[in-house]
């Protein structure tokens, strides 16, 4: 039975040209995390595998950094980075947990006033 829950940074905004940390946290389960995938709607960004370590998609190698922890840092943000991001926790014995983050990349002056809030 899957008892865990994923907490995410929810809906976030960031400045064009800046960087942002995508972070998820799995709680309320004793399941072992064996792999975490970071995904966009149509492609994989990165994998953190307990045995194999990090794999960063070549399309993102120049501006994606692993961490902190199981999170992902996106750098040199562009407006095209706006959209959904998913963390997928592969666990044993529970199975797969999914968290969703929506990132909006704004022009510098707008981002300063951008609200940050968490989706439960």
């Amino acid at each position: 039975m899957m008892t865990g829950t994923i907490e995410t940074t929810g809906n976030i905004s960031a400045e064009k040209g800046g960087s942002i940390i995508l972070q998820c946290h799995l709680s309320s389960t004793t399941a072992q995390v064996t792999q975490v995938n970071w995904e966009q709607q149509d492609q994989l960004l990165a994998i953190c595998n307990a045995d194999l370590g990090w794999h960063i998609s070549p399309s993102f190698k120049d501006r994606v950094a692993p961490g902190p922890g199981l999170g992902l840092t996106l750098q040199s943000l562009t407006v095209n980075d706006t959209g959904e991001y998913f963390c997928i926790y592969h666990t044993y014995p529970d199975g797969t947990y999914t968290g969703r983050i929506f990132l909006e990349v704004l022009e510098s002056s707008v981002a300063e006033h951008g609200a940050r809030f968490q989706i439960p």
């Epitope: 149509d42 492609q43 994989l44 994998i47």
Partner: antibody, heavy 119, light 107 residues
């Protein structure tokens, strides 16, 4: 339980357009994070992904088929559709609809509908 | 597009045999490979995702593994009901692409 069921005309003539329907039960096609895909399987068993409509309504096609395909949906009826034009004999295949997860894998499939393009 | 190659089109094990089906990706896909089973007259069924993660209800005699470009799907002790075509699929990027399939026929 999630179920998908395809329906279509079965036989169409070359150069014509076909309209296939996928009826989904057990889950709303607007349920977050899922994509609703069309996949075809040619007589030699080869599988080809055609495209999907996302829960939010955005649509993505296989670039090799973009010019000939249109995917739409009817959310009140919980159906999504594939329209393919300029058909040739090479489009003869079994057409499946499937649910696609965030990981881009297909966890539920319909039984398939056979399309034969022949004069 | 990422090309997925299954080098063996057919395999003919006896009941109880161990069978390994291989799949090669044309570029590094990390662990983003899924495996499907298609029995005669049926639609494909998901068996594994992320190379080694067993989908719900899949028997323990099936295992998946690999990373990078080389992936393996293994049946530790083939049963008569395992007669099917097995496909790999990369779920790394779009368009999603499948291998050509490996047909397992029981001797």
């Amino acid at each position: 339980d999630v179920q998908l069921q395809e329906s279509g005309p079965g036989l169409v003539k070359p150069s014509q357009t076909v309209f296939l329907t996928c009826t989904v039960t057990g889950i709303s096609i607007t349920t977050g994070n899922y994509k609703w895909s069309w996949i075809r399987q040619f007589p030699g068993n080869k599988l080809e992904w055609i495209g999907y409509i996302y829960y939010s309504g955005t649509i993505t096609y296989n670039p090799s088929l973009t010019s000939r395909t249109t995917i739409t949906r009817d959310t009140p009826k919980n159906q999504f559709f594939l329209e393919m034009n300029s058909l040739t004999a090479e489009d003869t295949a079994t057409y499946y609809c499937a649910r696609e997860t965030v990981l881009r894998v297909f966890d539920y499939w319909g039984q398939g509908t056979t399309l034969t393009v022949s004069s | 597009d990422i090309v997925m190659t299954q080098s063996h089109k057919f395999m003919s094990p006896s009941v109880g045999d161990r069978v390994s089906i291989t799949c090669r990706a044309s570029q590094d896909v990390g662990t983003a490979v899924a495996w499907y089973q298609q029995k005669p007259g049926q639609s494909p069924k998901l068996l594994f995702y992320s190379a080694s993660y067993r989908y719900t209800g899949v028997p323990d005699r099936f295992t998946g593994g690999g990373s990078g470009t080389d992936f393996t799907f293994t049946i530790s002790s083939v049963q008569a009901e395992d007669l099917a075509v097995y496909y790999c699929q990369q779920h790394y990027s779009s368009p999603r692409t499948f291998g050509g399939g490996t047909k397992v026929e029981i001797k």
